[in-house]
């Protein structure tokens, strides 16, 4: 162990991965297993997070950094640092207090998490529905009905044809 000699705070010499032991004349003692200190000059070590149950270990704890957890398959992380795991649902569903429920007509969810959201209202943008929505997909809005009047084309005009005898550049 390192005995520190700083004139100001002797603990400031204790590196990450150790704690400054007030009861032992400011000796820098290593953090015990399953604990860490991420900065120097600490008087305590933090107990490592344990990824148990529905949590699984994404990164092991070390003497200088905490463990990081994620969720087992079928669950996803919620909250800062994956503080909670929430059950996945299928696309086209949302999680309620009673479990996964299909999206109501007029709503969709294209992910395994989150809530069902209303289909886009194409008419608000003066457009028409090109592809109908489903429980899993939003509607696809197309050109406005006015753009589809006779003589108007929503299709990009073809590129001009090359002159015969000319090869591509």
């Amino acid at each position: 162990f390192e005995r520190t000699r700083s004139l100001q705070d002797p603990c400031s010499n204790c590196p990450a991965g150790t704690f400054c032991d007030n009861n032992r004349n400011q000796i820098c003692s290593p953090c015990p297993p399953n604990s860490f200190s991420s900065a120097g000059g600490q008087r305590t070590c933090d107990i490592c997070r344990q990824c148990k149950g529905v949590f699984r270990t994404r990164k092991e704890c070390s003497s200088t950094s905490n463990a990081e957890c994620d969720c087992t398959p079928g669950f996803h992380c919620l909250g800062a640092g994956c503080s909670m795991c929430e059950q996945d649902c299928k696309q086209g569903q949302e999680l309620t207090k009673k479990g996964c429920k299909d999206c109501c007509f007029g709503t969709f969810n294209d992910q395994k998490r989150g809530i069902c959201r209303p289909w886009t209202n194409c008419s608000l943008d003066g457009k028409s529905v090109l592809v109908n929505g489903t429980k899993e997909r939003d509607v696809v809005c197309g050109p406005s009905p006015a753009d589809l009047s006779p003589g108007a084309s929503s299709v990009t005009p073809p590129a001009p044809a090359r002159e015969p005898g000319h090869s591509p550049q």
Epitope: F19, D21, N22, N23, C31, P32, P33, N34, S35, R43, T44, C45, D46, I47, R49, Q50
Partner: nanobody, 120 residues
């Protein structure tokens, strides 16, 4: 709600021994360091020691007379006190924290304490 319950205190003669127990309900000790503190009448609370992951850290007064250990199966932490002196008379508290050691720490939870009296 976490509850810590200390037991094993009592009256003992100088030079005698006691083993205090700290049991947790509502949560296991798995994720926590467990500490012991004591408070004598009219005095400030004094740090006794902390146990975590097979390691124990002790206050500077106990001179190897006190030993902290843990029984995982019983979810109980013990404070073995040998060669007791009258100045060890105090209420002994068990506490848990996410910090090791707990010498400079306010615990997350603390029990109600158990009285230890050393007298002839």
């Amino acid at each position: 709600e976490v509850q810590l319950v200390e037991s094993g205190g009592g009256l003992v003669q100088p030079g005698g021994s006691l083993r205090l127990s700290c049991a947790a309900s509502g949560r296991t000790f798995d994720n926590y360091a467990v500490g012991w503190f004591r408070q004598a009448p009219g005095k400030e609370r004094e740090y006794v020691g902390t146990y975590w992951s097979g390691y124990a850290h002790y206050g500077d007064f106990e001179n190897n007379r006190f030993t902290i250990s843990r029984d995982n199966a019983k979810n109980t932490v013990y404070l073995q006190m040998n060669n007791l002196r009258p100045e060890d008379t105090a209420v002994y508290y068990c506490a848990i924290s996410l910090k090791y050691p707990m010498a400079t720490v306010t615990p997350d939870y603390q029990g109600q304490g158990t009285q230890v009296t050393v007298s002839s």
